[in-house]
Interface confidence: low
Protein backbone atom coordinates (compact mmCIF):
# COMPACT_ATOMS: atom_id res chain seq x y z
CA UNK A 1 0.00 0.00 0.00
CA UNK A 2 1.38 3.42 -1.02
CA UNK A 3 0.92 6.45 1.25
CA UNK A 4 0.34 9.84 -0.33
CA UNK A 5 0.19 12.66 2.23
CA UNK A 6 -0.52 16.38 2.24
CA UNK A 7 0.48 18.82 4.97
CA UNK A 8 -1.15 22.22 5.48
CA UNK A 9 1.08 24.71 7.31
CA UNK A 10 -0.61 26.39 10.30
CA UNK A 11 -0.18 29.87 11.70
CA UNK A 12 2.43 29.36 14.44
CA UNK A 13 1.01 32.25 16.50
CA UNK A 14 -2.33 30.50 17.08
CA UNK A 15 -2.95 28.71 20.38
CA UNK A 16 -3.05 24.88 20.17
CA UNK A 17 -1.74 25.15 16.63
CA UNK A 18 -0.18 21.73 16.92
CA UNK A 19 -3.35 20.01 18.15
CA UNK A 20 -3.65 17.21 15.62
CA UNK A 21 -6.76 15.63 17.17
CA UNK A 22 -10.26 16.49 16.15
CA UNK A 23 -12.52 17.43 19.08
CA UNK A 24 -15.20 14.87 19.96
CA UNK A 25 -18.06 17.23 19.08
CA UNK A 26 -17.88 19.95 16.43
CA UNK A 27 -20.24 22.52 14.94
CA UNK A 28 -20.36 21.97 11.20
CA UNK A 29 -21.67 24.19 8.43
CA UNK A 30 -25.01 22.88 7.19
CA UNK A 31 -23.91 23.00 3.56
CA UNK A 32 -22.13 19.88 2.38
CA UNK A 33 -19.15 20.78 0.29
CA UNK A 34 -18.06 19.22 -2.97
CA UNK A 35 -20.69 16.95 -4.43
CA UNK A 36 -24.39 17.25 -5.03
CA UNK A 37 -24.82 13.69 -6.21
CA UNK A 38 -27.02 11.29 -4.34
CA UNK A 39 -28.30 9.70 -7.48
CA UNK A 40 -29.43 6.20 -8.28
CA UNK A 41 -26.26 4.43 -9.50
CA UNK A 42 -28.36 2.80 -12.23
CA UNK A 43 -28.53 6.21 -13.89
CA UNK A 44 -24.88 7.12 -13.46
CA UNK A 45 -23.43 3.86 -14.83
CA UNK A 46 -24.62 0.65 -16.40
CA UNK A 47 -21.66 -1.38 -15.10
CA UNK A 48 -24.09 -3.37 -12.93
CA UNK A 49 -25.56 -4.86 -16.14
CA UNK A 50 -22.44 -5.05 -18.32
CA UNK A 51 -20.19 -6.65 -15.72
CA UNK A 52 -19.16 -10.31 -15.97
CA UNK A 53 -20.29 -10.37 -12.32
CA UNK A 54 -23.54 -8.41 -12.71
CA UNK A 55 -25.50 -7.16 -9.73
CA UNK A 56 -28.89 -5.83 -8.78
CA UNK A 57 -29.26 -2.60 -6.86
CA UNK A 58 -31.54 -2.47 -3.84
CA UNK A 59 -32.75 0.77 -2.30
CA UNK A 60 -32.05 1.10 1.44
CA UNK A 61 -33.95 4.04 2.92
CA UNK A 62 -33.69 5.43 6.44
CA UNK A 63 -35.03 8.92 7.24
CA UNK A 64 -32.91 9.05 10.41
CA UNK A 65 -29.74 8.88 8.31
CA UNK A 66 -28.00 11.20 5.86
CA UNK A 67 -27.86 10.29 3.07
CA UNK A 68 -31.31 8.79 3.61
CA UNK A 69 -31.09 6.59 0.49
CA UNK A 70 -28.19 4.19 -0.06
CA UNK A 71 -28.08 1.65 -2.90
CA UNK A 72 -26.90 -1.84 -1.98
CA UNK A 73 -25.49 -4.22 -4.58
CA UNK A 74 -26.41 -7.91 -4.61
CA UNK A 75 -24.52 -10.19 -7.03
CA UNK A 76 -26.97 -11.84 -9.45
CA UNK A 77 -25.05 -15.08 -9.82
CA UNK A 78 -22.75 -17.27 -7.79
CA UNK A 79 -20.62 -17.73 -10.91
CA UNK A 80 -19.53 -15.21 -13.57
CA UNK A 81 -20.80 -14.58 -17.09
CA UNK A 82 -18.51 -16.10 -19.70
CA UNK A 83 -17.93 -15.11 -23.33
CA UNK A 84 -20.97 -17.13 -24.42
CA UNK A 85 -23.20 -15.22 -22.03
CA UNK A 86 -23.63 -18.22 -19.74
CA UNK A 87 -22.93 -18.53 -16.02
CA UNK A 88 -19.51 -20.10 -15.48
CA UNK A 89 -19.55 -21.80 -12.11
CA UNK A 90 -15.77 -22.23 -12.13
CA UNK A 91 -15.48 -18.52 -11.23
CA UNK A 92 -17.21 -16.63 -8.43
CA UNK A 93 -19.08 -13.33 -8.34
CA UNK A 94 -18.29 -11.66 -5.03
CA UNK A 95 -19.45 -8.34 -3.56
CA UNK A 96 -17.00 -5.47 -3.16
CA UNK A 97 -17.72 -4.00 0.24
CA UNK A 98 -16.78 -0.61 1.58
CA UNK A 99 -17.12 1.09 4.95
CA UNK A 100 -18.61 4.55 4.52
CA UNK A 101 -19.43 7.34 6.94
CA UNK A 102 -22.98 8.62 7.18
CA UNK A 103 -24.79 10.92 9.60
CA UNK A 104 -27.19 9.46 12.15
CA UNK A 105 -29.68 11.81 13.81
CA UNK A 106 -28.84 11.86 17.50
CA UNK A 107 -30.99 12.26 19.51
CA UNK A 108 -33.43 10.63 17.07
CA UNK A 109 -35.58 12.94 14.93
CA UNK A 110 -33.55 16.06 15.80
CA UNK A 111 -33.15 18.20 12.69
CA UNK A 112 -29.62 19.55 13.24
CA UNK A 113 -27.85 17.15 15.59
CA UNK A 114 -25.96 14.19 14.19
CA UNK A 115 -23.38 11.57 14.97
CA UNK A 116 -21.05 9.94 12.48
CA UNK A 117 -21.85 6.31 11.80
CA UNK A 118 -19.75 3.77 9.96
CA UNK A 119 -21.81 1.42 7.78
CA UNK A 120 -20.81 -1.40 5.50
CA UNK A 121 -22.22 -1.27 1.98
CA UNK A 122 -21.84 -3.60 -0.99
CA UNK A 123 -20.99 -1.30 -3.87
CA UNK A 124 -20.78 -3.75 -6.75
CA UNK A 125 -19.46 -7.17 -7.64
CA UNK A 126 -16.27 -8.49 -9.17
CA UNK A 127 -15.39 -11.84 -10.70
CA UNK A 128 -12.69 -13.81 -8.89
CA UNK A 129 -10.91 -17.13 -9.20
CA UNK A 130 -12.19 -19.30 -6.35
CA UNK A 131 -9.93 -20.39 -3.52
CA UNK A 132 -9.64 -24.16 -3.94
CA UNK A 133 -9.26 -26.08 -0.69
CA UNK A 134 -7.46 -29.35 -1.40
CA UNK A 135 -8.52 -32.16 0.90
CA UNK A 136 -5.51 -34.06 2.19
CA UNK B 1 -26.59 21.01 -0.43
CA UNK B 2 -28.54 21.36 2.82
CA UNK B 3 -29.06 18.36 5.08
CA UNK B 4 -32.69 17.46 4.37
CA UNK B 5 -35.12 17.76 7.24
CA UNK B 6 -36.94 14.56 8.10
CA UNK B 7 -39.96 14.74 5.83
CA UNK B 8 -42.28 12.32 7.59
CA UNK B 9 -45.06 14.17 9.41
CA UNK B 10 -45.22 11.50 12.12
CA UNK B 11 -41.72 12.52 13.26
CA UNK B 12 -42.19 15.40 15.69
CA UNK B 13 -39.08 17.26 16.77
CA UNK B 14 -38.42 16.06 20.34
CA UNK B 15 -38.14 18.54 23.19
CA UNK B 16 -34.64 17.28 24.02
CA UNK B 17 -32.87 18.45 20.84
CA UNK B 18 -29.69 20.39 21.67
CA UNK B 19 -29.66 24.13 20.81
CA UNK B 20 -27.71 24.68 17.59
CA UNK B 21 -26.64 28.06 16.13
CA UNK B 22 -28.36 28.97 12.85
CA UNK B 23 -26.73 27.67 9.68
CA UNK B 24 -24.82 24.95 11.47
CA UNK B 25 -25.34 21.55 13.01
CA UNK B 26 -23.91 19.68 15.97
CA UNK B 27 -21.85 16.67 14.92
CA UNK B 28 -20.51 14.04 17.30
CA UNK B 29 -17.55 12.41 15.58
CA UNK B 30 -17.36 9.51 18.00
CA UNK B 31 -18.21 6.93 15.35
CA UNK B 32 -21.07 4.47 15.81
CA UNK B 33 -19.91 0.96 14.76
CA UNK B 34 -16.28 2.10 14.82
CA UNK B 35 -14.99 -1.43 15.31
CA UNK B 36 -16.95 -3.22 12.61
CA UNK B 37 -14.75 -4.85 10.02
CA UNK B 38 -15.16 -5.53 6.33
CA UNK B 39 -15.59 -9.27 5.81
CA UNK B 40 -14.74 -9.42 2.10
CA UNK B 41 -13.47 -12.63 0.54
CA UNK B 42 -9.71 -12.94 0.90
CA UNK B 43 -7.42 -11.00 -1.51
CA UNK B 44 -10.18 -10.29 -3.99
CA UNK B 45 -8.13 -7.40 -5.36
CA UNK B 46 -5.54 -9.94 -6.61
CA UNK B 47 -7.92 -12.79 -7.49
CA UNK B 48 -10.26 -10.59 -9.53
CA UNK B 49 -10.30 -10.74 -13.33
CA UNK B 50 -10.11 -6.93 -13.02
CA UNK B 51 -7.42 -6.68 -10.30
CA UNK B 52 -6.62 -3.47 -8.48
CA UNK B 53 -4.06 -1.86 -6.17
CA UNK B 54 -4.72 0.26 -3.10
CA UNK B 55 -3.30 3.68 -2.24
CA UNK B 56 -3.81 5.36 1.12
CA UNK B 57 -4.29 9.12 0.97
CA UNK B 58 -3.54 10.93 4.23
CA UNK B 59 -4.66 14.40 5.26
CA UNK B 60 -4.35 15.60 8.88
CA UNK B 61 -7.11 18.16 8.34
CA UNK B 62 -9.62 15.54 7.30
CA UNK B 63 -11.53 13.17 9.52
CA UNK B 64 -10.92 10.32 8.99
CA UNK B 65 -7.40 11.30 8.01
CA UNK B 66 -6.82 8.13 5.98
CA UNK B 67 -8.90 7.31 2.91
CA UNK B 68 -8.06 4.23 0.85
CA UNK B 69 -8.46 4.47 -2.93
CA UNK B 70 -8.32 1.59 -5.41
CA UNK B 71 -6.82 1.79 -8.91
CA UNK B 72 -7.45 -0.81 -11.63
CA UNK B 73 -4.18 -2.47 -12.66
CA UNK B 74 -5.17 -3.08 -16.26
CA UNK B 75 -7.25 -1.57 -19.02
CA UNK B 76 -8.42 -5.03 -20.03
CA UNK B 77 -9.40 -8.04 -17.92
CA UNK B 78 -7.39 -11.12 -17.00
CA UNK B 79 -8.51 -14.25 -18.86
CA UNK B 80 -8.36 -17.91 -17.80
CA UNK B 81 -4.76 -18.12 -19.10
CA UNK B 82 -3.68 -15.19 -16.91
CA UNK B 83 -3.26 -12.88 -19.90
CA UNK B 84 -4.82 -9.45 -20.34
CA UNK B 85 -7.84 -9.57 -22.67
CA UNK B 86 -8.32 -6.10 -24.15
CA UNK B 87 -11.70 -7.05 -25.65
CA UNK B 88 -13.01 -6.52 -22.10
CA UNK B 89 -12.53 -3.53 -19.80
CA UNK B 90 -11.53 -3.20 -16.16
CA UNK B 91 -13.54 -0.31 -14.73
CA UNK B 92 -13.56 1.33 -11.29
CA UNK B 93 -16.53 0.98 -8.94
CA UNK B 94 -17.04 4.12 -6.88
CA UNK B 95 -18.94 5.01 -3.72
CA UNK B 96 -19.51 8.32 -1.97
CA UNK B 97 -18.64 8.75 1.71
CA UNK B 98 -18.69 11.69 4.08
CA UNK B 99 -15.63 13.25 5.70
CA UNK B 100 -15.21 16.21 8.06
CA UNK B 101 -12.82 18.87 6.80
CA UNK B 102 -11.02 21.16 9.28
CA UNK B 103 -10.37 24.64 7.89
CA UNK B 104 -7.99 27.18 9.37
CA UNK B 105 -8.92 30.81 8.76
CA UNK B 106 -6.40 32.90 10.66
CA UNK B 107 -6.56 31.61 14.20
CA UNK B 108 -10.12 30.35 13.96
CA UNK B 109 -10.95 26.79 13.01
CA UNK B 110 -14.16 25.80 11.25
CA UNK B 111 -15.48 22.40 10.23
CA UNK B 112 -17.16 21.49 6.98
CA UNK B 113 -18.76 18.24 5.83
CA UNK B 114 -17.54 17.02 2.48
CA UNK B 115 -18.59 14.25 0.16
CA UNK B 116 -15.65 12.24 -1.12
CA UNK B 117 -15.81 9.79 -4.00
CA UNK B 118 -13.92 6.61 -3.13
CA UNK B 119 -12.90 4.02 -5.71
CA UNK B 120 -13.64 0.76 -3.95
CA UNK B 121 -12.47 -1.82 -6.48
CA UNK B 122 -12.83 -2.81 -10.10
CA UNK B 123 -15.11 -4.99 -12.18
CA UNK B 124 -14.78 -6.45 -15.65
CA UNK B 125 -17.33 -5.22 -18.19
CA UNK B 126 -18.16 -5.79 -21.82
CA UNK B 127 -17.24 -2.60 -23.66
CA UNK B 128 -19.88 -0.38 -25.24
CA UNK B 129 -19.35 -0.57 -29.00
CA UNK B 130 -20.18 2.65 -30.80
CA UNK B 131 -21.02 1.81 -34.42
CA UNK B 132 -19.94 4.50 -36.86
CA UNK B 133 -22.64 5.24 -39.42
Amino acid sequence: IVKAGITIPRNPGCPNSEDKNFPRTVMVNLNIHNRNTNTNPKRSSDYYNRSTSPWNLHRNEDPERYPSVIWEAKCRHLGCINADGNVDYHMNSVPIQQEILVLRREPPHCPNSFRLEKILVSVGCTCVTPIVHHVA
Amino acid sequence: RKIPKVGHTFFQKPESCPPVPGGSMKLDIGIINENQRVSMSRNIESRSTSPWNYTVTWDPNRYPSEVVQAQCRNLGCINAQGKEDISMNSVPIQQETLVVRRKHQGCSVSFQLEKVLVTVGCTCVTPVIHHVQ
Epitope: D84, N86, D88 | -
Partner: antibody
Framework: EVQLLESGGGLVQPGGSLRLSCAAS????????MNWVRQAPGKGLEWVST????????YYADSVKGRFTISRDNSKNTLYLQMNSLRAEDTAVYYC???????????WGQGTTVTVSS | EIVLTQSPATLSLSPGERATLSCRAS??????LAWFQQKPGQAPRLLIY???NRATGIPARFSGSGSGTDFTLTISSLEPEDFAVYYC?????????FGQGTKVEIK
Amino acid sequence: EVQLLESGGGLVQPGGSLRLSCAASGFTFSSYAMNWVRQAPGKGLEWVSTISGRGGSIYYADSVKGRFTISRDNSKNTLYLQMNSLRAEDTAVYYCAKEEATWDFDYWGQGTTVTVSS
Amino acid sequence: EIVLTQSPATLSLSPGERATLSCRASQSVSSFLAWFQQKPGQAPRLLIYDASNRATGIPARFSGSGSGTDFTLTISSLEPEDFAVYYCQQRSNWPPTFGQGTKVEIK
Protein backbone atom coordinates in the same frame (compact mmCIF):
# COMPACT_ATOMS: atom_id res chain seq x y z
CA GLU C 1 -44.26 -17.12 -23.59
CA VAL C 2 -41.87 -19.50 -21.83
CA GLN C 3 -43.00 -23.12 -22.09
CA LEU C 4 -41.36 -26.28 -20.75
CA LEU C 5 -42.80 -29.71 -21.52
CA GLU C 6 -41.42 -32.86 -19.92
CA SER C 7 -41.85 -36.38 -21.27
CA GLY C 8 -40.36 -39.87 -20.87
CA GLY C 9 -41.70 -40.82 -17.45
CA GLY C 10 -43.25 -44.18 -16.71
CA LEU C 11 -43.10 -47.36 -14.63
CA VAL C 12 -39.74 -49.05 -14.36
CA GLN C 13 -38.30 -51.86 -12.22
CA PRO C 14 -35.55 -51.22 -9.66
CA GLY C 15 -32.17 -51.22 -11.41
CA GLY C 16 -33.79 -50.12 -14.67
CA SER C 17 -33.26 -47.00 -16.76
CA LEU C 18 -35.31 -44.11 -18.14
CA ARG C 19 -34.54 -41.05 -20.20
CA LEU C 20 -36.54 -37.89 -19.52
CA SER C 21 -36.80 -35.02 -22.00
CA CYS C 22 -37.83 -31.40 -21.60
CA ALA C 23 -38.76 -29.43 -24.73
CA ALA C 24 -38.30 -25.68 -24.26
CA SER C 25 -39.74 -22.74 -26.18
CA GLY C 26 -40.32 -19.01 -25.78
CA PHE C 27 -36.76 -18.04 -24.77
CA THR C 28 -33.17 -18.33 -26.01
CA PHE C 29 -32.56 -21.82 -24.68
CA SER C 30 -28.76 -21.82 -25.03
CA SER C 31 -28.45 -18.68 -22.87
CA TYR C 32 -29.86 -20.26 -19.74
CA ALA C 33 -28.81 -22.96 -17.33
CA MET C 34 -31.48 -25.63 -16.87
CA ASN C 35 -32.36 -27.85 -13.92
CA TRP C 36 -34.21 -30.98 -12.92
CA VAL C 37 -36.14 -30.87 -9.64
CA ARG C 38 -38.21 -33.76 -8.31
CA GLN C 39 -41.04 -34.28 -5.86
CA ALA C 40 -41.75 -37.64 -4.25
CA PRO C 41 -45.44 -38.44 -3.66
CA GLY C 42 -46.81 -36.28 -0.84
CA LYS C 43 -43.34 -34.84 -0.17
CA GLY C 44 -41.46 -31.60 -0.76
CA LEU C 45 -39.21 -30.48 -3.61
CA GLU C 46 -35.66 -31.76 -4.13
CA TRP C 47 -33.14 -30.31 -6.57
CA VAL C 48 -31.56 -33.02 -8.75
CA SER C 49 -29.20 -31.53 -11.32
CA THR C 50 -28.07 -28.37 -13.16
CA ILE C 51 -26.46 -27.85 -16.56
CA SER C 52 -25.14 -24.49 -17.77
CA GLY C 53 -26.23 -22.91 -21.05
CA ARG C 54 -23.50 -24.43 -23.19
CA GLY C 55 -23.21 -27.56 -21.09
CA GLY C 56 -19.76 -26.72 -19.73
CA SER C 57 -20.75 -26.87 -16.06
CA ILE C 58 -22.80 -29.69 -14.55
CA TYR C 59 -23.92 -30.30 -10.96
CA TYR C 60 -25.69 -33.24 -9.31
CA ALA C 61 -27.30 -33.83 -5.95
CA ASP C 62 -25.38 -36.41 -3.90
CA SER C 63 -28.41 -38.72 -3.99
CA VAL C 64 -28.18 -39.19 -7.79
CA LYS C 65 -24.46 -38.70 -8.47
CA GLY C 66 -23.02 -41.51 -10.58
CA ARG C 67 -26.46 -42.77 -11.61
CA PHE C 68 -28.06 -39.81 -13.41
CA THR C 69 -26.66 -37.82 -16.34
CA ILE C 70 -27.94 -34.42 -17.39
CA SER C 71 -27.39 -33.19 -20.95
CA ARG C 72 -28.85 -30.78 -23.47
CA ASP C 73 -29.16 -30.34 -27.21
CA ASN C 74 -29.31 -26.62 -27.90
CA SER C 75 -30.06 -27.18 -31.59
CA LYS C 76 -33.27 -28.94 -30.52
CA ASN C 77 -33.99 -26.72 -27.48
CA THR C 78 -34.19 -29.88 -25.39
CA LEU C 79 -32.94 -30.87 -21.95
CA TYR C 80 -32.41 -34.53 -20.98
CA LEU C 81 -32.00 -36.60 -17.84
CA GLN C 82 -30.65 -40.12 -18.27
CA MET C 83 -31.54 -42.14 -15.16
CA ASN C 84 -29.76 -45.47 -14.57
CA SER C 85 -29.74 -47.90 -11.63
CA LEU C 86 -33.12 -46.61 -10.53
CA ARG C 87 -34.26 -47.17 -6.95
CA ALA C 88 -37.66 -47.07 -5.26
CA GLU C 89 -36.70 -43.74 -3.64
CA ASP C 90 -36.33 -42.17 -7.11
CA THR C 91 -40.12 -42.42 -7.52
CA ALA C 92 -41.28 -38.84 -8.03
CA VAL C 93 -42.67 -36.23 -10.38
CA TYR C 94 -39.68 -34.79 -12.25
CA TYR C 95 -39.84 -31.13 -13.27
CA CYS C 96 -37.49 -29.26 -15.56
CA ALA C 97 -36.91 -25.66 -14.49
CA LYS C 98 -35.32 -22.71 -16.25
CA GLU C 99 -32.73 -20.79 -14.24
CA GLU C 100 -32.74 -16.98 -14.38
CA ALA C 101 -29.79 -16.56 -12.01
CA THR C 102 -27.90 -19.27 -10.13
CA TRP C 103 -30.54 -21.75 -8.89
CA ASP C 104 -33.19 -19.08 -9.32
CA PHE C 105 -35.95 -21.23 -10.83
CA ASP C 106 -38.28 -18.82 -12.62
CA TYR C 107 -40.20 -21.19 -14.93
CA TRP C 108 -41.18 -24.82 -14.43
CA GLY C 109 -42.67 -27.51 -16.63
CA GLN C 110 -45.75 -29.47 -15.62
CA GLY C 111 -43.69 -32.53 -14.70
CA THR C 112 -43.46 -36.16 -15.72
CA THR C 113 -44.05 -39.05 -13.31
CA VAL C 114 -41.42 -41.74 -12.71
CA THR C 115 -42.46 -44.82 -10.73
CA VAL C 116 -39.82 -47.33 -9.69
CA SER C 117 -41.48 -50.51 -8.48
CA SER C 118 -41.24 -54.25 -8.90
CA GLU D 1 -26.27 -28.42 3.33
CA ILE D 2 -28.55 -25.61 4.46
CA VAL D 3 -31.77 -26.81 6.08
CA LEU D 4 -34.86 -24.63 5.67
CA THR D 5 -37.57 -25.04 8.29
CA GLN D 6 -41.02 -23.69 7.48
CA SER D 7 -43.71 -22.90 10.02
CA PRO D 8 -46.47 -23.53 10.60
CA ALA D 9 -46.91 -26.82 8.73
CA THR D 10 -50.56 -25.92 8.14
CA LEU D 11 -52.33 -22.58 8.30
CA SER D 12 -56.14 -22.59 8.44
CA LEU D 13 -57.56 -19.22 7.41
CA SER D 14 -60.60 -17.70 5.73
CA PRO D 15 -60.64 -15.66 2.50
CA GLY D 16 -59.83 -12.03 3.22
CA GLU D 17 -57.57 -12.85 6.17
CA ARG D 18 -53.85 -12.13 6.35
CA ALA D 19 -51.46 -15.07 6.05
CA THR D 20 -47.95 -14.97 7.52
CA LEU D 21 -45.62 -17.84 6.62
CA SER D 22 -42.17 -18.28 8.13
CA CYS D 23 -38.98 -19.84 6.78
CA ARG D 24 -35.87 -20.23 8.92
CA ALA D 25 -32.44 -21.22 7.54
CA SER D 26 -29.88 -23.27 9.49
CA GLN D 27 -27.25 -20.69 8.49
CA SER D 28 -27.30 -17.31 6.76
CA VAL D 29 -28.45 -17.31 3.13
CA SER D 30 -28.12 -13.51 2.81
CA SER D 31 -31.13 -12.51 0.69
CA PHE D 32 -30.90 -15.49 -1.68
CA LEU D 33 -34.30 -16.92 -0.78
CA ALA D 34 -37.32 -17.57 -3.01
CA TRP D 35 -40.95 -18.49 -2.33
CA PHE D 36 -43.04 -20.80 -4.52
CA GLN D 37 -46.73 -21.63 -4.62
CA GLN D 38 -47.88 -25.11 -5.60
CA LYS D 39 -51.45 -26.25 -6.16
CA PRO D 40 -52.42 -29.95 -6.36
CA GLY D 41 -51.37 -31.53 -9.65
CA GLN D 42 -49.53 -28.39 -10.77
CA ALA D 43 -45.92 -27.26 -11.03
CA PRO D 44 -44.49 -24.81 -8.50
CA ARG D 45 -44.88 -21.15 -9.43
CA LEU D 46 -42.29 -18.54 -8.46
CA LEU D 47 -43.79 -15.80 -6.28
CA ILE D 48 -40.85 -14.02 -4.65
CA TYR D 49 -37.15 -14.09 -5.50
CA ASP D 50 -34.18 -12.75 -3.54
CA ALA D 51 -36.29 -12.44 -0.38
CA SER D 52 -38.45 -9.48 -1.32
CA ASN D 53 -38.82 -9.11 -5.09
CA ARG D 54 -42.14 -10.10 -6.64
CA ALA D 55 -41.82 -12.23 -9.77
CA THR D 56 -43.45 -11.13 -13.02
CA GLY D 57 -47.24 -11.20 -12.88
CA ILE D 58 -47.49 -11.84 -9.12
CA PRO D 59 -50.20 -9.76 -7.39
CA ALA D 60 -49.17 -7.08 -4.89
CA ARG D 61 -50.90 -8.91 -2.03
CA PHE D 62 -47.85 -11.22 -1.94
CA SER D 63 -44.79 -9.77 -0.23
CA GLY D 64 -41.56 -11.19 1.12
CA SER D 65 -39.22 -9.90 3.79
CA GLY D 66 -36.21 -10.92 5.82
CA SER D 67 -32.51 -11.59 5.37
CA GLY D 68 -29.89 -13.84 6.88
CA THR D 69 -31.75 -16.71 8.55
CA ASP D 70 -35.33 -15.49 9.08
CA PHE D 71 -37.77 -14.88 6.26
CA THR D 72 -41.49 -14.19 5.97
CA LEU D 73 -44.00 -14.51 3.15
CA THR D 74 -47.10 -12.39 3.73
CA ILE D 75 -50.37 -12.62 1.83
CA SER D 76 -52.17 -9.44 2.86
CA SER D 77 -55.71 -10.61 2.06
CA LEU D 78 -56.30 -14.21 1.02
CA GLU D 79 -58.13 -14.83 -2.24
CA PRO D 80 -59.80 -18.21 -2.93
CA GLU D 81 -57.05 -19.08 -5.44
CA ASP D 82 -54.31 -18.56 -2.81
CA PHE D 83 -55.10 -21.75 -0.88
CA ALA D 84 -52.13 -23.97 -1.75
CA VAL D 85 -48.77 -25.23 -0.48
CA TYR D 86 -45.95 -22.69 -0.21
CA TYR D 87 -42.26 -23.58 -0.32
CA CYS D 88 -39.20 -21.50 0.42
CA GLN D 89 -35.92 -22.23 -1.39
CA GLN D 90 -32.37 -20.97 -0.86
CA ARG D 91 -29.78 -20.46 -3.59
CA SER D 92 -26.99 -19.10 -1.43
CA ASN D 93 -25.08 -22.37 -1.01
CA TRP D 94 -24.72 -25.59 -2.95
CA PRO D 95 -26.87 -27.60 -3.04
CA PRO D 96 -29.99 -25.46 -3.45
CA THR D 97 -32.52 -26.63 -0.88
CA PHE D 98 -36.25 -26.26 -0.25
CA GLY D 99 -38.29 -26.04 2.92
CA GLN D 100 -40.78 -28.80 3.69
CA GLY D 101 -43.72 -26.54 2.81
CA THR D 102 -46.61 -24.76 4.53
CA LYS D 103 -50.14 -25.68 3.53
CA VAL D 104 -52.59 -22.78 3.56
CA GLU D 105 -56.07 -24.27 3.79
CA ILE D 106 -59.58 -22.87 4.04
CA LYS D 107 -60.89 -22.74 7.59
